[in-house]
């Protein structure tokens, strides 16, 4: 695979990561070099504490901070360095589980891989040029910091600490692949890969924003749908000290403090679910694009891949409208999502609707980004549900979903697909955090009439639920499209926050496939036991935990 140069062997004989590891990156006064030391140093450029509780709770926890007395570029690079340093074993195992053979030595689609490599190289080169031409731009400053953080992560993992001044290169098939996992779903189609990661109709997350009666609270919940091989999870807390621009005169950015659900070696969420110090909670579910005519908009120049635009918007925005304005610039048409931006600063507990700003919805497809304030809708219906189907009619139509409704029926419709109906039926049962966890983990496919698939044999289908369990579909069944097949895929977590929890940068989180109404997932007893799942527990029976930041 494309594991950065020295490959997986470097100092990884012991793959059992320590329960806790604390490291700092120092700027050595005498040599001028960055260096790693154990513990938290008062004058460190960056420091991180990784607590590995994967076997106990299904999560590892990363607490990472940087020091504002150093310039942003140094902070960003050092943040990457220290993250890789404390989580190198987890990074190795996650890479092996998910990416090791992607465009690797045994890849038979060499043509696609060459196209992908070329696309990424041109795109990275274009961004470097833009960064040079727009050195005073807050946007391009944040893009540069994001890429520097990735560079630090990769350098550190490879056992090299060389802070880049001026231009720097990112390997297109190195740890960039871990960042672009979402973008790849669309790049594969845009670049004509024959066997794509994406199954037709495959869901990629459920989410709900629920206004409790009397507006006594506003709960935000997200359930990631992913391959089970991705279940090495880290909840990350970043406390950065970046400025809006490269000079010291610039003010600090709004989103320096953030907590998010993530993966080893990934410097953003990917789920996506963020609690930001700016008072925003940002989350998405993937809507994809089923219209081949739109792939022409996916070009390596003039676009910034979604993972970077996501990071930049989270850092710079103070409200939903600004977040959308930042995010929609340089639309790549990759990782096409419905984004929900909740602004808790605008929410009045026990109060009336402020009319706007509490909820902003953004939908992206190639060549198009549509944004609307949906605060009034939220207060009228008391919830906003998201389930991988575009809300905006123009996006729904342009992305080719009408054809799929014509071909397969209501499963692809916005109002009548199984999750839309389950959310509509059950959202009123949410009255607190625990009932919200129950809803976002809900899967009672064997007994719920809304989980039936009329064209399937058997009819009950584990994909047709808020938290899918596609491993439970029979292998020998008959299904109209791939998403309904048996596969090692489903809802792999839950994250829920509230007005008061978000203020404290906290959440309730559970890791692993749902087992509320179903037998728990166990690798050794599953049809997928031979798949790589290094570092993962065998049996997934974890309860929700309150994220334990000190």
């Amino acid at each position: 695979g494309a594991l950065p140069t020295q490959g997986p062997g470097r100092r990884r004989q012991n793959l059992d990561p320590p329960v806790s590891r604390v490291r700092s990156v120092l700027l050595d006064a005498a040599s001028g070099q960055l260096r790693l030391v154990d513990g938290i140093h008062p004058y460190a450029v960056a420091w991180a504490n990784l607590t590995n509780a994967i076997r106990e709770t299904g999560w590892a926890y990363l607490d990472l901070g940087t020091n504002g007395s150093y310039n942003d570029s140094l902070q960003a690079y050092a943040a990457g360095v220290v993250e890789a340093s404390v989580s190198e074993e987890l990074i190795y195992m996650h890479w092996m589980n998910t990416m090791v053979n992607y465009c690797g030595p045994f890849e038979y689609e060499v043509g696609y891989c060459e196209k992908l490599k070329s696309f990424l190289e041109i795109n990275l080169e274009w961004m470097q040029r833009e960064m040079e031409l727009s050195q005073d731009s807050p946007y391009w400053h944040q893009v540069r910091l994001t890429l520097l953080q990735l560079k630090g992560l990769e350098d550190s993992y490879e056992g090299r600490l060389t802070f880049p001044t001026g231009r720097f290169t990112i390997k297109p098939l190195g740890f960039l692949l871990l960042q672009i996992a979402g973008d790849l779903e669309d790049l594969e189609q845009a670049l004509n890969k024959t066997s794509t990661k994406l199954s037709l109709g495959s869901g990629s997350c459920s989410a709900i924003i629920k206004l409790l009666p009397g507006a006594r609270d506003l709960l935000v919940a997200h359930n990631t749908w992913n391959s089970y091989q991705n279940m090495l999870r880290i909840i990350k807390k970043y406390q950065l000290q970046f400025r809006q621009g490269p000079q010291e005169a610039y003010p600090l950015i709004a989103g320096n403090n953030l907590v998010f659900s993530s993966y080893p070696g990934t410097i953003f969420s990917g789920d996506d679910f963020y609690i930001l110090g700016s008072g925003l909670v940002t989350l998405e579910t993937t809507i994809g694009n089923k219209n081949p005519a739109l792939w022409k908009y996916v070009q390596p120049q003039g676009c910034v891949l979604e993972w970077i635009r996501n990071i930049v918007a989270n850092r710079l925005a103070l409200d939903g409208a600004t977040w959308a304005d930042i995010f929609k610039q340089f639309n790549s048409g990759t990782y096409n999502n419905q984004w929900m931006i909740v602004d808790y600063k605008a929410f009045i507990p026990n109060g009336p609707s402020p009319g706007s700003r509490v909820l902003t919805i953004l939908e992206q497809i190639p060549g198009m980004v549509v944004v609307a304030d949906k605060t009034e809708d939220l207060y009228k219906t008391t919830y906003w549900a998201s389930y991988n189907i575009p809300f905006f009619e123009i996006v729904f139509n342009a992305s080719g979903l009408q054809d799929l409704v014509a071909q397969y029926g209501d499963w692809f419709s916005y109002t009548k697909n199984p999750r839309a109906q389950i959310f509509q039926r059950d959202q009123s049962l949410v009255e607190d955090m625990n009932s919200m966890v129950r809803l976002i983990r809900y899967n009672n496919f064997l007994h719920d009439p809304l989980s039936l698939c009329e064209a399937c044999i058997p009819k009950p289908n584990a994909e047709n639920a808020i938290s899918a369990r596609s491993d439970l579909n029979p292998a020998n069944g008959s299904y109209p499209f791939q998403a309904l097949y048996q596969r090692p895929h489903g809802g792999i977590d839950v994250k829920v926050t509230s007005f008061s929890l978000a203020k404290r940068m906290s959440m309730l989180a559970a890791s692993g496939p749902t087992w509320d109404q179903l037998p728990p997932f166990q690798w050794s007893l599953s049809p997928f036991r031979s798949m790589l799942h290094m570092g993962q527990p065998d049996l997934w029976t974890f309860s929700p935990i309150s994220v334990p930041w000190d």
């Epitope: 006064a29 005498a30 513990g39 004058y43 550190s156």
Partner: antibody, heavy 118, light 107 residues
Framework: EVKLEESGGGLVQPGGSTKLSCAAS????????MDWVRQCPEKGLEWVAE??????????YYAESVKGRFTISRDDSKSCVYLQMNSLRAEDTGIYYC?????????WGQGTSVTVSS | DIVMTQSQKFMSTSVGDRVSVTCKAS??????VAWYQQKPGQSPKALIF???YRFSGVPDRFTGSGSGTDFTLTISNVQSEDLAEYFC?????????FGSGTKLELK
């Protein structure tokens, strides 16, 4: 538990050579910057040389008084750091300590004595 | 080279006293100063780094202060086991340099 153990000291003729070794354990050696410090009655504690980690290209730094005569090196696979001392002089006599430079020289070995005399 | 001057070679003290060992750098070394304790026949032991931060396990009666060129190691409530030689060291520039030491003795 961090341990540093020096060896290789002894009596050496002026102009002669010797190689000091330091075996380390209890920490991730390849990440560590390692130093040699000597202590002689007349000069007190005197920093001799440093070698940075593999990640920092194993860069070496020397005191002016030993430059060109002493060479610091490391073998990460053995968790050892070495000090090759050539063209030894009487003023090189002293106890040589191997140290790990964490925040500063946070761990020291027990030292090995080098005497340069005819 | 930066010269670290410990002007007092010896200091007399009694158990329970408070004593301050001083060290002066010939140029600005920011807070890149460490203090070490050495007992006869033993190797030096690190007490303080970055001028004022104690290493773990070092009793809180040891306090470091200063920045720039003037640095102090204070031992409050001196114990008999504190009778030793104390060295300051700068690691702001190569070559790293040590003070000549201050020996703490009983009155």
């Amino acid at each position: 538990e961090v341990k540093l153990e020096e060896s290789g000291g002894g009596l050496v003729q002026p102009g002669g050579s010797t190689k000091l070794s330091c075996a380390a354990s209890g920490f991730t050696f390849s990440d560590a910057w390692m130093d040699w410090v000597r202590q002689c009655p007349e000069k007190g504690l005197e920093w001799v040389a440093e070698i940075s980690s593999k990640a920092n290209n194993r860069a070496t730094y020397y005191a002016e008084s030993v430059k060109g005569r002493f060479t610091i090196s490391r073998d990460d696979s053995k968790s050892c750091v070495y000090l090759q001392m050539n063209s030894l002089r009487a003023e090189d006599t002293g106890i040589y300590y191997c140290t790990r430079r964490g925040y500063t020289m946070d761990y020291w070995g027990q030292g090995t004595s080098v005497t340069v005399s005819s | 080279d930066i010269v670290m001057t410990q002007s007092q070679k010896f200091m007399s003290t009694s158990v329970g006293d408070r004593v301050s060992v001083t060290c002066k750098a010939s140029q600005n070394v920011d807070t890149n100063v460490a203090w070490y304790q050495q007992k006869p026949g033993q190797s030096p032991k690190a007490l303080i780094f970055s001028a004022s931060y104690r290493f773990s396990g070092v009793p809180d009666r040891f306090t470091g202060s200063g920045s720039g060129t003037d640095f102090t190691l204070t031992i409050s409530n001196v114990q008999s086991e504190d009778l030793a030689e104390y060295f300051c060291q700068q690691y702001n520039n190569f070559p790293f340099t040590f003070g000549s030491g201050t020996k703490l003795e009983l009155k």
